[in-house]
Amino acid sequence: MMTGTIETTGNISAEKGGSIILQCHLSSTTAQVTQVNWEQQDQLLAICNADLGWHISPSFKDRVAPGPGLGLTLQSLTVNDTGEYFCIYHTYPDGTYTGRIFLEVLESSVAEHGARFQIP
C-alpha cells in the first residue's frame, strides 16, 4: 500500500536568463528511494540513482545542475523552458510516486512587476 505523499514547489515563475530550483520531497513513507527521475514532458533531464549518483542528459548538461539534495537547478532559462516538470520517485517496496511542478519563464520586465506565481 502506498502511503507516501510528494510535496513540490508547485507553480513557480522565474526570470528569463535566470535560474530556478525544482524541489520535491517525499514524506509519510518508510520506503527506500532507489532513484529519482526529473522529466519535462517526455524528455528525461536527469536521474539521481541511489547507487550510481547523478547523471544529466547530454542535451541538458550545459543548463542543468544536480541538487540541492534530490532537487534540480535549471540555469540560463528561456521562455521555451515554460511548462510542466515531473519528479518521479522510484521506491521500494512502494513503487513510483510522481510530483508535478509548473514553471513559467517570464521576460525580465514582467517578472520584476509582480508576475503570477512569483516567489518572494
Epitope: 528525461l44 540513482n49 550510481l52
Partner: nanobody, 117 residues
Framework: EVQLVESGGGLVQAGGSLRLSCAAS????????MGWLRQAPGKEREFVSA????????NYADSVKGRFTISADNAKNTVYLQMNSLKPEDTAVYYC??????????WGQGTQVTVTS
C-alpha cells in the same frame, strides 16, 4: 530486464593492475548509467565509479581517483574498470550496476578482487 555479468577479478600483488569487465544484455535501451560498487568483508557496499552512457561523463569515489579508470564500449554494451596501483584495502567483491530510466536497476553477481601485500 538487464542482465549484468562481471569478469576480470583475481588475486594480485599490491601495486599491480586488474581490468574488470561488465557485459550487459537484455533490455539495455533505457540504460542511463553504469558503474561499479564494491563490498569488503564486514563492510557496507560502497560506490566506486560510474559512467553516463549518453556522453561518457564519469564520476569516482575519492579513494580511487587517479588510480581507477572507468570506460564504456556502447557497441558491445560493456563497461570496464581499469584498476592500477592496487592496495590491500581495495580487496572486495566488485559489483556492476546499471541505472535505467524505468527505475528498475540491475546488479551483477560480483567478481572477487584480492590484493595481497
Amino acid at each position: 530486464e538487464v542482465q549484468l555479468v562481471e569478469s576480470g577479478g583475481g588475486l594480485v600483488q599490491a601495486g599491480g593492475s586488474l581490468r574488470l569487465s561488465c557485459a550487459a544484455s537484455g533490455r539495455t535501451f533505457d540504460t542511463y548509467a553504469m558503474g561499479w560498487l564494491r563490498q569488503a568483508p564486514g563492510k557496507e557496499r560502497e560506490f566506486v565509479s560510474a559512467i553516463s552512457t549518453g556522453d561518457g561523463s564519469t564520476n569516482y569515489a575519492d579513494s580511487v581517483k587517479g588510480r581507477f579508470t572507468i570506460s564504456a564500449d556502447n557497441a558491445k554494451n560493456t563497461v570496464y574498470l581499469q584498476m592500477n596501483s592496487l592496495k590491500p584495502e581495495d580487496t572486495a567483491v566488485y559489483y556492476c550496476a546499471a541505472a535505467r530510466r524505468s527505475g528498475r536497476g540491475s546488479w551483477g553477481q560480483g567478481t572477487q578482487v584480492t590484493v595481497t601485500s
